[in-house]
Interface confidence: low
């Protein structure tokens, strides 16, 4: 359906509040270094213009595309050249190249200070003084740090943020009420950002076929009672929504997401019995709820897959007639029967099935050739099962912090060229898989663990793409989306790596260590651990454990001393000397 004025169409569909929020998110994700006030000014200008178009769709410039309107607005920023350097060159381009140029300059690791949480009373005063500005600031700060955050979902987070302050700023103990809620929003927000980043990477690096395959598998697990046609329709619509959001088309994305939620709620009977409680909620909550909905129960009478996909003499004919539909149906049928498999495993199985048909349908006796195809799946299934089993055992034995350390050592040995902050961030997050997934029942462990690991490893891939330093990382990240995790798992100690020269400065610590939070202390220790492994990649577990135990004892001793700084100055060099001797 065509509209005279796209901006008027979206303003009317979304309403002023969501329109303004989404434009602020879009601008903040593109120009991540711009001050808040500058963005608010741009958003207000766009909103006033949109209102004139609502009043008269034939008014001047109202017929322009959103990319043209938004791009023109961004290019009015006076400090573009000095703040963003070559990104300013985007403004010399015409649409659609200009928008593509802005997208390419999104920075996954912007040089922004970490957000510091003010005192609760300070936050509550700011909230009460100007609620609208307070919430806009939240959208701005999150969006500029997470340039691929799923915009309509960020509006949902902002609504929860508002609700937390509205409730807790009136509570007797404001801090006890508010801080756990803010911690939860922060952790959920980081997880949401990382999940969306994988979706965008999937679309941008591997194309919509890869995303659609992921979506077929995941939705078939969630909605095993739905017909293939229904799943396909949802996949088509979901792909459009995420393509738009990943492409910076946030108004279209939010509008289409709302349409998809409406469709799902109107067609619950042919999708899933689990949608009912989501569909009674308001829009933002409803869309979130639908995205997170639990898997429906599997139909009781599903027949064996072998009849249609192995035993049938028509397999090659059906495959040849419409490869993607046939493979899509195979993936749908396999996934709806296996909620206990990770999506990535299901995609590997579909890939293996496709490879077998490509080979066998050209053979003299195709049926004989593909008759054992399901047997070939066994090792593919067992590999992640064993990986989850071994790592959950290790997690239960060590606890989260030491499990993270084990992964830090493992990954630093695999890819020692990667920067220390990246190795620490990624390994800490890989280590969180234990607490997240190992407590779950057996049938939920693999989908939880492997699909979470895919999200974390994607973070490694996007950071590495910005500053590539390791051919091994590039290879694992770019060759196959579904085989990324097995590729990283298979990496061994990098024998070609030249150990980093010892730098005493790296292992010099001061009294400020004592005032750090527990998490910050862990990060400091883990940073030192990575540097140790980079210096001595062949150090044994026992050697590294000895050094780390000594380190913990040395820090504890000096933090208890009367003159902490003097203790660090005296004991530090002794610790360094002892460590060098232990690793020699």
């Amino acid at each position: 359906d065509t509209h005279k004025s796209e901006v008027a169409h979206r303003f009317k569909d979304l309403g002023e509040e969501h329109f303004k929020g989404l434009v602020l998110v879009a601008f903040s994700q593109y120009l991540q270094q711009c001050p808040f006030e500058e963005h608010v000014k741009l958003v207000n200008e766009v909103t006033e213009f949109a209102k004139t178009c609502v009043a008269d769709e034939s008014a001047e410039n109202c017929d322009k595309s959103l990319h043209t309107l938004f791009g023109d607005k961004l290019c009015t920023v006076a400090t573009l050249r000095e703040t963003y350097g070559e990104m300013a060159d985007c403004c010399a381009k015409q649409e659609p190249e200009r928008n593509e140029c802005f997208l390419q300059h999104k920075d996954d690791n912007p040089n922004l200070p970490p957000l510091v949480r003010p005192e609760v009373d300070v936050m509550c005063t700011a909230f009460h003084d100007n609620e609208a500005t307070f919430l806009k600031k939240y959208l701005y700060e999150v969006a500029r740090r997470h340039p691929y955050f799923y915009a309509p979902e960020l509006l949902f987070f902002a609504a929860r943020y508002k609700a937390a302050f509205a409730e807790c700023c009136q509570a007797a103990d404001k801090a006890a009420c508010l801080l756990p809620k803010l911690d939860e929003l922060r952790d959920e927000g980081k997880a949401s950002s990382a999940k969306q980043r994988l979706k965008c990477a999937s679309l941008q690096k591997f194309g919509d076929r890869a995303f659609k395959a992921w979506a077929v598998a995941r939705l078939s697990q969630k909605f095993p009672k739905a017909e293939f046609a229904e799943v396909s329709k949802l996949v088509t619509d979901l792909t459009k929504v995420h393509t738009e959001c990943c492409h910076g088309d946030l108004l279209e994305c939010a509008d289409d997401r709302a349409d998809l939620a409406k469709y799902m709620c109107e067609n619950q009977d042919s999708i899933s019995s689990k949608l009912k409680e989501c569909c009674d909620k308001p829009l933002l909550e409803k869309s979130h709820c639908l995205a997170e909905v639990e898997n429906d129960e599997m139909p009781a009478d599903l027949p064996s897959l072998a009849a249609d996909y192995v035993e049938s003499k028509d397999v090659c004919k059906n495959y040849a007639e419409a490869k993607d539909v046939f493979l899509g149906m195979f993936l749908y049928e396999y996934a709806r029967r296996h909620p206990d498999y990770s999506v990535m495993l299901l995609l590997r199985l579909a890939k293996a099935y496709e490879a077998t048909l490509e080979k066998c349908c050209a053979a003299a006796d195709p049926h004989e050739c593909y008759a054992k195809v399901f047997d070939e799946f066994q090792p593919l299934v067992e590999e992640p099962q064993n990986l989850v089993k071994q790592n959950c055992e290790l997690f239960e034995q060590l606890g989260e912090y030491k499990f993270q350390n084990a992964l830090l050592v493992r990954y630093t040995k695999k890819v020692p060229q990667v920067s220390t902050p990246t190795l620490v961030e990624v390994s800490r997050n890989l280590g969180k898989v234990g607490a997240k997934c190992c407590k779950l029942p057996e049938a939920k462990r693999m989908p939880c663990a492997e699909d979470y690991l895919s999200v974390v490893l994607n973070r490694l891939c996007v950071l590495h793409e910005k500053t590539p330093v390791s051919e091994k990382v590039t290879k694992c990240c770019t060759e196959s989306l579904v085989n990324r995790r097995p590729c990283f798992s298979a990496l061994e100690l990098d024998e070609a790596y030249v150990p980093k020269a010892f730098n005493a400065e790296t292992f010099t610590f001061h009294a400020d260590m004592c005032t750090l939070s527990e998490k910050e202390k862990q990060v400091k220790k883990q940073t030192a651990l990575v540097e140790l492994v980079k210096h001595k990649p062949k150090a044994t577990k026992e050697q590294l454990k000895g050094v780390m135990d000594n380190f913990a004892a040395f820090v504890e001793k000096c933090c208890k001393a009367d003159d902490k700084e003097a203790c660090f100055a005296e004991e530090g060099p002794k610790f360094v000397a002892a460590s060098q001797a232990a690793l020699a």
Epitope: F228, A229, E230, S232, K233, T236, D237, N267, S270, D308, D314, N318, E321, A322, V325, F326, G328, M329
Partner: nanobody, 115 residues
Framework: QVQLVESGGGLVQAGGSLRLSCAAS????????MSWVRQAPGKGPEWVSA????????RYAESVKGRFTISRDNAKKTLYLQMNSLKPEDTAVYYC????????GSQGTQVTVSS
């Protein structure tokens, strides 16, 4: 609810013609390739013809090439199969499916060709 309802079948003399229709509802018809499949008495389903979502690319089983024509009207959400020069071996229940599936999701329409 996804629904496919076929019509247009009947009894016809060998050499005659029929035009089958399939009315679709409950899904975005214009987003999917569609097929005609038939099942003769006592036999398994046999794929007959397919058409892509835009109605550009059409494909036919060897046994019907040159005699049958598949088409679609996305505005009307309807799939068609024009069958000319019918033979007794074309006798079967004909049903439309989404994509290239040969799994029946509908009742079908009976075509009987007498010699």
């Amino acid at each position: 609810q996804v629904q496919l309802v076929e019509s247009g079948g009947g009894l016809v003399q060998a050499g005659g013609s029929l035009r089958l229709s399939c009315a679709a509802s409950g899904f975005t018809f214009g987003s999917f390739g569609m097929s005609w499949v038939r099942q003769a008495p006592g036999k398994g389903p046999e794929w007959v013809s397919a058409i892509d979502s835009g109605g550009v690319d059409t494909r036919y089983a060897e046994s019907v090439k040159g005699r049958f024509t598949i088409s679609r009207d996305n505005a009307k959400k309807t799939l068609y199969l024009q069958m000319n020069s019918l033979k007794p071996e074309d006798t079967a229940v004909y049903y439309c499916t989404i994509g290239q599936s040969t799994s029946r999701g509908s009742q079908g329409t009976q075509v009987t060709v007498s010699s």
